[in-house]
Structure formats: C-alpha cells, structure tokens
Amino acid sequence: CKAMHVAQPAVVLASSRGIASFVCEYASPGKATEVRVTVLRQADSQVTEVCAATYMMGNELTFLDDSICTGTSSGNQVNLTIQGLRAMDTGLYICKVELMYPPPYYLGIGNGTQIYVIDPEPCPDSDF
C-alpha cells in the first residue's frame, strides 16, 4: 500500500454536551479528488469503526443520516465532529484516510486523538 502521512491532535476534551471536534490533515501525494475518511475507535486493544464518509474534493462531506459524525473538508484537511459522547466513550479515535481516485490508491492512518468525555454532574434540586 502506498503510505501517506495523516496528522491529528493528540488530545481533545469533549464538551459538556458530549461533542468533540478535531482536524484530520493528510499530506496528499497527488491530485487527490475522491477521499474516504474513516474514524476508528481503539479501546482495550479492540478497534471499531465509528463512522465513514467518501467525498469528492470541492463537495461536502456527507456521513450517513444516522451517523454520530459530521464534518467539513477544506483542501487537505477534514474537520470532524463526533456527537452524543458519554464518559464510557472515552478512548483513542483514529483518523484513517484513503485516496480512492485517481489511482494509485493511497492509505494513511493517524496516530489517534485521545478524546476524554466527562459526564456532566446532574443538577442539584433547587428549593426556589
């Protein structure tokens, strides 16, 4: 497989609403025009696919309707947002980028972003 460098932040803290955003940047060796981005979650040596999207350069990045991910693309970077996260979802989120067209096919896998999710404290009852 032709390898490609993929960069992503080491650590991200999810918001109190369970939303985490990070940028996945790839060093395209050629005129990449169709790209597939996959977010993988690694926890306890198990890797699962969180979401994936294929997009043409200049077109919007569209995940499936029921996906917990949304994103936008700009040049060689993808801004990814993962929603609905809870404390149990804390883990390493790896960005995998495939240059699908034109040939040749390239694959790049980032080192992962550790996303920390802290469940919000329930609001105390107020006596007002």
């Epitope: 169709e34 077109n59 034109p102 040939p103």
Partner: antibody, heavy 120, light 112 residues
Framework: QVQLVQSGAEVVKPGASVKISCKAS????????INWVKQNPGQGLEWIGD????????NSNQKFEGRATLTVDTSISTAYMELSRLRSDDTAVYYC?????????????WGQGTLVTVSS | DIVMTQSPLSLPVTPGEPASISCRSS???????????LYWYLQKPGQSPQLLIY???NLASGVPDRFSGSGSGTDFTLKISRVEAEDVGVYYC?????????FGGGTKVEIK
C-alpha cells in the same frame, strides 16, 4: 434514467481546435467524475483524462497534456473537451463517460460518441 | 504505462457454446488493499462501450450471469458460458490501478 448526450460530428482543419460537449441528465452532475476516451477508426480505446465537476480539477494522459482542455459548466450539467492544434491522427470518435464509485471507478455510462474528422 | 494485451484478436463463436477471452497486464493489478483493478467492457456494433465486469470478477448491474471474470494479478479471463447472438462485439479489458488508465486492444467476437 442516466444519460450523457454529446454534441454532433465535426469536420475541422489541421491546426484548428474543436470543442465537444457532453450533457448529463438523470443524476446529480457533481457527484461523479467525467472521463474522456478516444477511439481511433476501427481501433481500440485511449484514455484522455478526467474532470471533477465540483472544482474543475483534472487528471490527464500525458500524451494529450497541453492539447486537451477539460472543463465543466455545472449550471447546465455539461462537460466539455477542447482539443487544440489538431492533426490528422486526431481523427477519431471521442466519448465522455461517467465514473461510478460503487464500481470502483469504472465507467458505467457512456455518451453516444462524437466523430471528429481532421481534414484539409 | 501499464500495457494490456488481449488474445485472441478475433473469436468466431457458435451460439450456445462457451467462449473465453484472455487479457494480460504488464504489471500486477492486484493491490495490497486486496482489490484487483481490472475491468471488462463490451462495445456492440454501432454502439458505445458498456461496462460488463469491475474488480476482475464482479458483474455490473444488468449484465447476464452467463458472463464471468477471473484471473490472477496479471492474467485475466472473461468467460461466456453460453454465447448468444446479442453478445457479438468487441470486448476490451482495462486497468485503473494507475494513471493513465489503459485498455487492451480488443477481441472481436463474431458468430461463425
């Protein structure tokens, strides 16, 4: 249904240019690459290049680089190929074809072809 | 450029009988991602080419199952289990492992 309709046959003089159109219908034009392919009389197929309708980005066969210009007009879902400095060996049928990602970027729909005859 | 070589150049066939076309590439089309970037197209007389097979062995939508594709990294075969009159035309193999995309010279299938 998906259709790619190309412009009609052209007779052009050596050294001149020709611009062929390919109007797409039946699908979202910006969702698929358009390829251009040359077929010499009674012979095989030769890839010229492709264009991404979203940003006009192209990839070309070096053999045609500098002479084949690929463009699109998304407002009318039409792709164009202009071939300049024409020579007699440019006499051929030219096809546009749509790429389909589900078929790993094979050409799943083709235009009917445009015959270009280069003759003085 | 990857060179695609087809044989035979011409193939006279009898309706109802099987037929086989060979294609060889100058470089392996089997990528380390497991995909074989080999395609078959058919150009019927007076028509534009049409896609038959993608990724070496997958039938495109609407293609009859009498067609099948097989092969290794460099040697490929298109088989028609029982030829029908409508199968006449020129068959092309093609690769899109790398640019430029290249086609074989074609095999003309005609009824005996």
């Amino acid at each position: 249904q998906v259709q790619l309709v190309q412009s009609g046959a052209e007779v052009v003089k050596p050294g001149a240019s020709v611009k062929i159109s390919c109007k797409a219908s039946g699908y979202k034009f910006t969702d698929h690459f358009i390829n251009w392919v040359k077929q010499n009389p009674g012979q095989g197929l030769e890839w010229i290049g492709d264009i991404n309708p979203n940003n006009g980005g192209t990839n070309s066969n070096q053999k045609f680089e500098g002479r084949a210009t690929l463009t699109v007009d998304t407002s009318i879902s039409t792709a164009y190929m202009e071939l300049s400095r024409l020579r007699s060996d440019d006499t051929a049928v030219y096809y546009c074809a749509r790429l389909r990602r589900e078929y790993f970027y094979a050409m799943d729909y083709w235009g009917q072809g445009t015959l270009v005859t280069v003759s003085s | 450029d990857i060179v695609m070589t087809q044989s035979p150049l011409s193939l006279p066939v009898t309706p109802g009988e099987p037929a086989s076309i060979s294609c060889r590439s100058s470089k392996s089309l089997l990528h380390s991602n497991g995909i074989t970037y080999l395609y078959w197209y058919l150009q019927k007389p007076g028509q534009s080419p049409q896609l038959l097979i993608y990724q070496m062995s997958n039938l495109a939508s609407g293609v009859p199952d009498r067609f099948s594709g097989s092969g290794s990294g460099t040697d490929f075969t298109l088989k028609i289990s029982r030829v029908e009159a409508e199968d006449v035309g020129v068959y092309y193999c093609a690769q899109n492992l790398e640019l430029p995309l290249t086609f074989g010279g074609g095999t003309k299938v005609e009824i005996k």
